[in-house]
């Protein structure tokens, strides 16, 4: 058993049929010695008396809010949560496996630049009685500070018969060094509590590996005289690291109709303009990627050919 | 050429060669990103490689103030990786695929380090740790980790030279 936060404790249980469970001793936080009784949740049934209560925790029915009283007055609470371990593996029932970029990916994180700011998100089908707490650091043995905000519900989607909820959190490295080569990864730890179930999820990454620039901005077209060609120009996204002579992007420019199966014109460039062939009912799209490190491409920025 | 004591390197040449290094480092192991190498006890194997750190003057401001600190750091790293790529980690079993770009990568690391430091001038170089894995699978894993680390190192070097070519070239 360990303390998650004040008056909240996590009991780690090997979860299999007829498992013996864990013996837990609860102590009432009071100077009083006599006349103390214990109850669980809303029940008025007295579970025991005395300053300490010993219980055998085997299942969710044994978890919950234990309260010690004296003469009708509440002295203190202890909330017990369960963390299940099945076949040596901690349960991952609360969050959905996003399966990208690999199986058992519960947390996904992205950064728009090298400033040390990043966003992580996760998915669940659970809609109520759900809380998350996020901690992060750079490195684990001698951790350097990363400050994370509160996790918030950022999107709701209908997937087949059930709803899916996306939560996200923003974090910022306290002393970021955008130009340096990272040697220690960022660690992100998410505590998830659903009713009386506790689970924790972790992710470890370098900012450079989660970079995904915003799409290029201000796409403009200029038809070339006596030609089917069009000069398309754009600018670096506002959120990208500066100066651009140092933090350079490379771009992919594509002309395509509405269907992915349609023919296309495609060209790669390090410049912020390119000449392409525009077709009626097609769109010109441009996306960006770090020029020197193959992290994710941005989403496409598009303008119609016409 | 970056001569110890102060003259400027051939920024544009260094830019072109460092960008080539980036391309080669990724083609040497493009799928390395799909492997979570940190799960494999990263600390003792690649913590010894020279990293371009915050105080090394490789940021735009540091380059403007005095690029020599940064260039020396890059030079150390290039020599370090060049030696690693020539060591039995890469030459031993399992043999590299004949079409592996590691040979080109090795040559390009040497080429860029020579651009930065002509013969007769010597910056101190970092000692190569004795990383001699006994098992072929350990060697394979170590190659992945070294190449992964090299990708990050050459990306920073390429940024430095691109910025230098754009803003510091005579």
């Amino acid at each position: 058993i360990w303390e998650l936060k004040k008056d909240v404790y996590v009991v780690e249980l090997d979860w299999y049929p007829d498992a013996p469970g864990e013996m837990v001793v609860l102590t009432c936080d009071t100077p009083e010695e006599d006349g103390i009784t214990w109850t669980l949740d809303q029940s008025s049934e007295v579970l025991g008396s005395g300053k300490t209560l010993t219980i055998q925790v085997k299942e969710f029915g044994d978890a919950g809010q234990y309260t010690c009283h004296k003469g009708g007055e509440v002295l203190s609470h202890s909330l017990l949560l369960l963390h299940k371990k099945e076949d040596g593996i901690w349960s991952t029932d609360i969050l959905k496996d996003q399966k990208e970029p690999k199986n058992k990916t519960f947390l996904r994180c992205e950064a728009k630049n090298y400033s040390g700011r990043f966003t992580c998100w996760w998915l669940t089908t659970i809609s109520t009685d759900l809380t998350f707490s996020v901690k992060s650091s750079r490195g684990s043995s001698d951790p350097q500070g990363v400050t994370c905000g509160a996790a918030t519900l950022s999107a709701e989607r209908v997937r087949g018969d059930n709803k899916e909820y996306e939560y996200s959190v923003e974090c910022q490295e306290d002393s970021a060094c955008p130009a340096a080569e990272e040697s220690l990864p960022i660690e992100v730890m998410v505590d998830a509590v659903h009713k009386l179930k506790y689970e924790n999820y972790t992710s470890s990454f370098f900012i450079r590996d989660i970079i995904k620039p915003d799409p290029p901005k201000n796409l403009q077209l200029k038809p070339l005289k006596n030609s089917r060609q069009v000069e398309v120009s754009w600018e670096y996204p506002d959120t990208w690291s500066t100066p651009h002579s140092y933090f350079s992007l490379t771009f992919c420019v594509q002309v395509q109709g509405k269907s992915k199966r349609e023919k296309k014109d495609r060209v790669f460039t390090d410049k912020t303009s390119a000449t392409v062939i525009c077709r009626k009912n097609a769109s010109i799209s441009v996306r960006a990627q770090d020029r020197y490190y193959s992290s994710s491409w941005s989403e496409w920025a598009s303008v119609p050919c016409s | 050429r970056a001569v110890p004591g102060g003259s400027s390197p051939a920024w544009t040449q260094c830019q072109q060669l460092s960008q080539k290094l980036c391309t080669l480092a990724w083609s040497a192991h493009p799928l390395v990103g799909h492997m979570d190498l940190r799960e494999e006890g990263d600390e003792e194997t690649t913590n010894d490689v020279p990293h371009i750190q915050c105080g090394d003057g490789c940021d735009p401001q540091g380059l403007r103030d005095n690029s020599q600190f940064c260039l020396q750091r890059i030079h150390q790293g290039l020599i370090f990786y060049e030696k690693l790529l020539g060591s039995d980690i890469f030459t031993g079993e399992p043999s590299l695929l004949p079409d592996s770009p590691v040979g080109q990568l090795h040559a390009s690391l040497l080429g860029l380090s020579q651009l930065l430091q002509p013969e007769g001038h010597h910056w101190e170089t970092q000692q190569i740790p004795s990383l001699s894995p006994s098992q072929p699978w350990q060697r394979l894993l170590l190659r992945f980790k070294i190449l992964r680390s090299l990708q990050a190192f050459v990306a920073v070097a390429a940024r430095v030279f691109a910025h230098g070519a754009a803003t510091l070239s005579p």
Partner: antibody
Framework: QVQLVQSGAEVKKPGASVKVSCKAS????????LHWVRQAPGRGLEWMGW????????ESAPKFQGRVTMTTDTSTSTAYMELRSLRSDDTAVYYC???????????WGQGTMVTVSS | EIVMTQSPATLSVSPGERATLSCRAS??????LHWYQQKPGQAPRLLIY???QSTSGIPARFSGSGSGTEFTLTISSLQSEDFAVYYC?????????FGGGTKVEIK
């Protein structure tokens, strides 16, 4: 599968014109760009131009502008390349090729030998 | 127009050996570079597109790398059917241009 079959060899006199055909099969004709590339005997490849069969748009290399006409007949899935004012250095194998991507050449015809000789 | 230069013009290699073919552009073309193989009496066939992407059905012994102005086609272990002429082609800008070719012949 995608296939391009070209017309047979031609012998022409200097100053004449030649029209080479290229019949496509195995795909929807308007879904691919069509290019013409030529190769003089013992020489390298030279791009001449492209046509979009969907709308008839064309673009040709500056070297051939005013001398080459590329057309298509969607009813027969056939592309044509006409080269006028032939000279002896136009002697070459002329290839048509098709691709969904405009700027490189995936599927090639077997080639048509055009000999310009007096 | 962009001029593409291939080297060497002829490469003599023994079967089973590795062949490295170079292609240089007269200006930076990012990764807009494609490789073709042509055997005598046949049309060319696409091997590699956008510098390093392998065309389906092409043996894994063919690989491409490079960006900017310098590109390489590597054939890791030459088979008898690989002796041919290889062309690079830039697609950075029109007119599309080819290199002069590298003939890979049996040593």
């Amino acid at each position: 599968q995608v296939q391009l079959v070209q017309s047979g060899a031609e012998v022409k006199k200097p100053g004449a014109s030649v029209k080479v055909s290229c019949k496509a099969s195995g795909y929807t004709f308007t879904d691919y760009y069509l290019h013409w590339v030529r190769q003089a005997p013992g020489r390298g490849l030279e791009w001449m131009g492209w046509i979009d069969p969907e709308n008839g748009d064309t673009e040709s290399a500056p070297k051939f502008q005013g001398r080459v006409t590329m057309t298509t007949d969607t009813s027969t899935s056939t592309a044509y390349m006409e080269l006028r004012s032939l000279r002896s250095d136009d002697t070459a194998v002329y290839y048509c090729n098709a691709n969904k991507e405009l700027r490189y050449f995936d599927v090639w015809g077997q080639g048509t030998m055009v000999t310009v000789s007096s | 127009e962009i001029v593409m230069t291939q080297s060497p013009a002829t490469l003599s290699v023994s079967p089973g050996e590795r062949a490295t073919l170079s292609c240089r552009a007269s200006q930076s073309i990012s990764i807009n570079l494609h490789w073709y193989q042509q055997k005598p009496g046949q049309a060319p066939r696409l091997l590699i597109y956008f510098a390093s992407q392998s065309t389906s059905g092409i043996p894994a012994r063919f690989s491409g790398s490079g960006s900017g102005t310098e590109f390489t086609l590597t054939i890791s272990s030459l088979q008898s059917e690989d002796f041919a002429v290889y062309y690079c082609q830039q697609s950075n800008s029109f007119p599309l241009t080819f290199g002069g070719g590298t003939k890979v012949e049996i040593k």
